[in-house]
């Protein structure tokens, strides 16, 4: 059974994941982002089901494509590069989903834009956090 300290750690990790997903979305939704139209042409796979931590496997599998799309931003000056954000997200995802069991991700038939994709995983984090608090 999960202890109170392990639940707290999970909650904190989910909050950090949530913050960085929201950070990425903020940058994409910035009305001054000239690459937004191009970014929206790329399609992402969405999970058929995302209700448990093991379903983060579906997010992990889309992190490389996500980084590639974020690289389109090509800002003159990055506070954080796309690879910094994706690297941190990857570490958190691996810790949260664990590596004990291999879960085969099932994807929905419909693909999504980067904005829909990020919103889906933001909602996932918020939902899991709400069950832990």
């Amino acid at each position: 059974a999960p202890t109170s300290s392990s639940t707290k750690k999970t909650q904190l990790q989910l909050e950090h994941l949530l913050l960085d997903l929201q950070m990425i979305l903020n940058g994409i939704n910035n009305y001054k982002n000239p690459k937004l139209t191009r970014m929206l042409t790329f399609k992402f796979y969405m999970p058929k089901k995302a209700t448990e931590l093991k379903h983060l496997q579906c997010l992990e599998e889309e992190l490389k494509p996500l980084e590639e799309v974020l690289n389109l931003a090509q800002s003159k000056n990055f506070h954080l590069r796309p690879r910094d954000l994706i690297s941190n997200i990857n570490v958190i995802v691996l810790e949260l989903k664990g590596s004990e069991t291999t879960f085969m991700c099932e994807y929905a038939d419909e693909t999504a834009t980067i904005v829909e994709f990020l919103n889906r995983w933001i909602t996932f984090c918020q939902s899991i956090i709400s069950t832990l608090t």
Epitope: E15, H16, L17, L18, L19, D20, L21, Q22, M23, I24, N26, G27, N30, K32, A73, S75, K76, N77, F78, H79, L80, R81, P82, D84, L85, S87, N88, I89, I92
Partner: nanobody
């Protein structure tokens, strides 16, 4: 409006350490990047290190392994622990606060704190 207050600068000998702090106040959001930039006389401002509220970090190659950036989300404060300081680290260090991972005109900047590495 966001206000940034930096502290911790000073004179230190080569090989020494300093810890810079930057506290943000005002219209603070939970989603942010805070970082440290520096400008030496006659040079352009350059990134030293940055950190997101979610924990993503970015370091300039010249400071990797010597400097560590950390943050306290509850206090809206970012810290820069600088070890093994070199004379070439001498500069004015500026704190930055941004709501996006890339620089734009909505970013806020501190007044700067002088770091001098000299024997």
């Amino acid at each position: 409006e966001v206000q940034l207050v930096e502290s911790g600068g000073g004179l230190v000998q080569p090989g020494g350490s300093l810890r810079l702090s930057c506290a943000a106040s005002g219209s603070i959001f939970s989603i942010y990047v805070m970082g440290w930039y520096r400008q030496a006389p006659g040079k352009q401002r350059e990134l030293v290190a940055a950190i997101s509220s979610g924990g993503s970090t970015n370091y300039a190659d010249s400071v990797k392994g010597r400097f560590t950036i950390s943050r306290d989300n509850a206090k809206n404060t970012v810290y820069l622990q600088m070890n093994s300081l070199k004379p070439e680290d001498t500069a004015v260090y500026y704190c930055a606060y941004a709501s996006s991972w890339y620089e734009d005109e909505t970013d806020y900047w501190g007044q700067g704190t002088q770091v001098t590495v000299s024997s």
